[in-house]
């Protein structure tokens, strides 16, 4: 951007510049071209020697300029147009300047002026061109600086040329106010900071509703001496609730939102949200719908699932296999898990209570992802009720629960009562008993044993009787022994696990029950 301090051509002859000597050297002239007056300062005293004609501009306020550019448009006539080449004729003129803090008015003193340059034309106007009105216009530019006073004058010295000065334009350069990457850069005077640093670094200001991204660099640009912006660094982003539209940040329209400062546009409110107001940073969930803490704001709001479908409990002696299908309504989420709880009731008293501690699950009964689980170690003559609850990421945000229940009665044998009959260093003789009324239902007994503390030495023996001798055991070793009745329906109740110890090789006769 050029900031013009003086423009002779634009002033339409209204500038009364000082001429010295008055009226005999430079003077203002008017010509009409295309019905428009063209003004020029001209001088053409080529036949008289010793010309020293000065034309001084009015005082020009410097404003913020440090270096100024002077553009001259002028014509110079060929000295050969004049008789004998006019020995005193010249084809150049001199350009001067003087700085001052005040306007000296008509007080003109040559000694105050410093020469900028001798101005020579690229093209001179020869006689034939002049008479054919085909004058050759020259354009020359000079730079002056640094300036330090409040203002300055320019002066043109004629020493015997035939010159017409049509345009004098004085300006300085600024990098214009600019919007770039949502940052506003102020109008900046184009100055070289130093010879080695020809660029001025300028910090930008984020436009309304834009911010420097977290951890990012603030916007910077470089203003060159030629008044051009270069090398943008950093950026601004539209803050939450606003999106970039051309060079501004505009509030998200109703029904749209933006949750963070980013380059992304506003997003439409997802499903199951209420219509947002202008400039929304999120969209509220509809009643009955929720957002889990880890859910992105762009995700639809969801709700807890309905209860599992078709829960079945299949009794297999002292075991039950629970099977169910996924809820009809998943609540719009994929993160469904199931949890199983167990309640047992005594038929005689009708008393009920939780049974998690006494039963065994084939896998942990909380946060199940599969739709089946086996429950074992059920007690005979007991009614069990199993509840399977479906949960998802937003279930914790409501108090109601979505579960289905199934009940099963266990008409199993009572667990065998086991005791150690005899032992040696390498064997254990174990006996058991069950109520006579249940004996007819028992098909066989299954004895499982292993060394205590050794999960890999698992052994099973089956027998139809009420005793078994376990051989080939290690001396002075504790074994874990359990007896379970096998019935037509499957496994019956198992006895509790007993610890029996073989004798040491010294032959101690102690019995452990």
């Amino acid at each position: 951007k050029e900031v013009v301090l003086l423009d002779f051509a634009a002033m339409k002859g209204e500038l009364g510049w000082l001429t010295h000597p008055y009226g005999k050297g430079w003077d203002l002239m008017q010509n009409i071209m295309d019905d428009m007056p063209i003004y020029m300062y001209s001088v053409c005293n080529v036949v008289s020697g010793d010309q020293d004609n000065w034309l001084r501009t009015n005082w020009v306020y410097r404003e913020e300029a440090e270096r100024i550019f002077i553009e001259l448009k002028f014509t110079v006539r060929d000295c050969n147009s004049f008789p004998g080449g006019a020995s005193s004729c010249k084809e150049t003129f001199n350009l001067y300047y003087a700085e001052s803090d005040v306007d000296y008015g008509t007080n003109f003193q040559k000694r105050q002026f410093t020469k900028i340059d001798t101005i020579a034309p690229d093209e001179i106007t020869v006689s034939s061109d002049f008479e054919a009105r085909n004058v050759k216009l020259n354009v020359e530019e000079r730079m002056v600086g640094p300036l330090t006073r409040k203002g300055f004058y320019l002066a043109f010295q004629d020493i015997g040329a035939c010159v017409a000065l049509l345009s004098v334009r004085v300006y300085y350069k600024k990098c214009p106010e600019m919007l770039q990457s949502l940052a506003r850069f102020p109008e900046t005077i184009a100055v070289a900071v130093s010879d080695t640093q020809p660029l001025a670094t300028v910090a930008g200001t984020c436009v309304d509703h834009a911010v420097v991204p977290y951890g990012g660099e603030g916007p910077l640009m470089h203003c060159t001496v030629d008044g051009e912006w270069l090398v943008p660094i950093g950026q601004c982003l539209c803050q939450e609730g606003y999106e970039k539209v051309e060079d501004a940040c505009r509030a998200c329209s109703p029904g749209f939102f933006k949750s963070e400062a980013s380059e992304s546009p506003c997003l439409e409110c997802p499903e199951h949200t209420l219509p947002s107001t202008e400039g929304a940073t999120s969209c509220q969930c509809e009643e009955g719908y929720f957002r889990a803490p880890e859910d992105p704001l762009s995700m639809s709001c969801t709700r807890p699932p309905s209860a599992p479908n078709y829960l079945t409990a299949i009794g297999m002696g002292a075991k039950v296999e629970l099977r169910w299908t996924a809820p009809k309504d998943t609540g719009g989420r994929q993160d469904i898990v199931y949890s199983v709880t167990c309640e047992q009731c005594w038929p005689e008293s009708g008393e009920c209570g939780p049974c998690e501690a006494s039963v065994r699950y084939s896998e942990p009964p909380h946060a199940l992802t599969r739709t089946s689980v086996t429950v074992s170690d059920l007690e005979p003559h007991m009614n069990y009720t199993f509840a399977v609850e479906a949960r998802n990421g937003v279930s914790g945000l409501v108090t109601s629960r979505s579960f289905r229940t199934a009940s099963v009665s266990i008409n199993q044998t009572e667990p065998p009562k086991v005791r150690l009959e005899d032992r040696s260093t390498t064997s254990l003789s174990v006996t058991w008993s069950i109520p006579v009324s249940q004996q007819s239902r028992v098909w066989k007994y299954e004895v499982t044993y292993r060394k205590k503390g050794d999960a890999n030495s698992y052994n099973v023996r089956r027998t139809e009787g009420f005793s078994v001798t376990l051989d080939d055991l290690a001396p002075d070793t504790t074994y874990l022994v359990q007896v379970q009745a096998l019935t037509q329906e499957g496994q019956g109740a198992g006895s509790k696990v007993h610890e029996f110890q073989t004798l040491s090789t010294e032959g101690s006769a102690n019995m452990a029950v």
Partner: antibody
Framework: QVQLVQSGGGLVQPGGSLRLSCAAS????????MHWVRQAPGKGLEWVAV????????YYADSVKGRFTISRDNSKNTLYLQMNSLRAEDTAVYYC?????????????WGQGTLVTVSS | SSELTQPPSVSVAPGQTVTITCQGD??????ASWYQQKPGTAPKLLIY???NRPSGVPDRFSGSSSGTSASLTITGAQAEDEADYYC????????????FGGGTKLTVLG
């Protein structure tokens, strides 16, 4: 409208003095250089003097230098020519004229003229 | 010298073209201005610069210049054009500020 109205002419004896006035109207008087031009009876036009727009510069024809003084009062929009040591050859119709641009003209507005007769 | 020389008189038949000339060294450097003066009135500017006419001046008046000569041409002269015509120019010698030609009396015959 734009005009120059002159006054102050008359008969004066040789060696006498006279002051001519030229009242301007219809334009910004203080922006223009002003001239006096005279015309002896039956003769051509002769340039006499010029004054710059602000009164800071004055020039005279050799024939009147030292005897005539050109001045102006921009607050009154008036141009003056003080003529001293008048001679018979100064007898003429005196015109004030406006230089349309610069110092030297052209002269686009002229007064109606006022006759100065120097005779004993 | 700083003189401008004009013919003392010229004549023209109505409707014909007439040219009045002005000679002088200053005209090599500066354009002439032309003035018309009718008896008992002040001069009136006709032409200035390259060939510029102030508003109100009929376009039958035109100016030209070449070397040390300037010309005023009246194309299709009319009876009311009978008057004295003066050329004027800046003085390139620096002796004077401005100079007038001696004037030319134009007679429109008939």
């Amino acid at each position: 409208q734009v005009q120059l109205v002159q006054s102050g002419g008359g008969l004066v004896q040789p060696g006498g003095s006279l002051r001519l006035s030229c009242a301007a109207s219809g334009f910004t008087f203080s922006s223009y250089a002003m001239h006096w031009v005279r015309q002896a009876p039956g003769k051509g036009l002769e340039w006499v003097a010029v004054i710059s727009y602000d009164g800071s510069n004055k020039y005279y024809a050799d024939s009147v230098k030292g005897r005539f003084t050109i001045s102006r009062d921009n607050s009154k929009n008036t141009l003056y020519l003080q003529m001293n040591s008048l001679r018979a050859e100064d007898t003429a119709v005196y015109y004030c004229a406006r230089a349309s641009v610069g110092a030297t003209g052209p002269f686009d507005i002229w007064g109606q003229g006022t006759l100065v007769t120097v005779s004993s | 010298s700083s003189e401008l020389t004009q013919p003392p008189s010229v004549s023209v038949a109505p409707g014909q073209t007439v040219t009045i000339t002005c000679q002088g060294d200053s005209l090599r450097s500066y354009y002439a201005s032309w003035y018309q003066q009718k008896p008992g009135t002040a001069p009136k500017l006709l032409i200035y610069g390259e060939n510029n006419r102030p508003s109100g001046v009929p376009d039958r008046f035109s100016g030209s210049s070449s070397g040390t000569s300037a010309s005023l041409t009246i194309t299709g002269a009319q009876a009311e054009d009978e008057a004295d015509y003066y050329c004027n120019s800046r003085d390139s010698s620096g002796t004077h500020l401005t100079v007038f030609g001696g004037g030319t009396k134009l007679t429109v015959l008939g």
